[in-house]
Amino acid sequence: RVDRCSLQPCRNGGLCLDLGHALRCRCRAGFAGPRCEHDLDDCAGRACANGGTCVEGGGAHRCSCALGFGGRDCRERADPCAARPCAHGGRCYAHFSGLVCACAPGYMGARCEFPVHPDGASALPAAPPGLRPGDPQR
């Protein structure tokens, strides 16, 4: 008798059962369908380190890392200041409670976004036209 399960019809690690009249797939947690082809939970069994959270979607999964961590599983130390979160030349410092900007003279705000003297010039330095919020950072 031919072992029809040798053709490995079950996807994503599902267990093949030859019932004689038909084949059945017993799916692992997070998968469904006759051949376990549907990924119900992209994040099943995936761990993100250092407080990262698994983000599902599109048949793939990735970790969204907590501030200060990066890499595929959030195991790598990342510099949260590398994204340049302070405006107008402010200097970024990573603090245990979050980021801190030390503003250049003449600017204020958590991210140094506002001029100190409201009666001064009415325009801020122009934004570079090539950069759009949402575009990849250069």
């Epitope: 590398a82 340049r84 302070c86 405006a87 958590a110 009415s122 801020l124 570079p128 919020p133 949402g134």
Partner: antibody, heavy 124, light 113 residues
Framework: QEQLVESGGGLVQPGGSLKLSCKVS????????VSWVRQAPGKGLEWIGY????????YYASWVNGRFTISSHNAQNTLYLQLNSLTAADTATYFC?????????????????WGPGTLVTVSS | DVVMTQTPASVEAAVGGTVTINCQAS??????LSWYQQKPGQPPKLLIY???TLASGVPSRFKGSGSGTQFTLTISDLECADAATYYC???????????????FGGGTEVVVK
Amino acid sequence: QEQLVESGGGLVQPGGSLKLSCKVSGFDFSNYGVSWVRQAPGKGLEWIGYIDPAFGRTYYASWVNGRFTISSHNAQNTLYLQLNSLTAADTATYFCVRVALVVAGVAYYGMDVWGPGTLVTVSS
Amino acid sequence: DVVMTQTPASVEAAVGGTVTINCQASQNIYSYLSWYQQKPGQPPKLLIYRTSTLASGVPSRFKGSGSGTQFTLTISDLECADAATYYCQSYYYSSGSSYGAFAFGGGTEVVVK
């Protein structure tokens, strides 16, 4: 793909409370914050407040007066808006919105990605 | 708090025409002025930020100008698809309370004939 999806809206009695959730994905909080904005049926947009998770700061419109609270959780992938002491005037669609704060050293403060919104109806 | 006064409340223009929407801030907001377009049943869409910079994918028919307290959105070569409500939005910072806040204008309905 940057995305924000609100949930938790529904019918609530006057004086009641509701907690709205906003699931976010696809962007880094070093450069972006998340704002809550509401819109009553047939009316304009009204800003409620915003959270800047990387800096641990939350700001509110003065009219909120402590009734609403914005918080974040779980490596900042889910944000919340707690609504308390609700009245009929709070009936609105509540939007969760990404705010481009400072990107690559340039300040923007524009709301560039909007969720579809969740409807809150306050009625007895 | 900053109050944003948007005028007119409604404006009608023909296809191919030009529409101008004004937004006045009650105090100096520098360049922190954004414009949004909203169509019925949809969330708003960012058109312009930092007074005059077009958001990704927005046609150059949309033009923002101004600074300080007076701002303008101009839509030229009007198309039927431009029929929508337009909102201005400011960001300002109160140094006394270390307080950053946003405010929206009341909206302008654009009707395209």
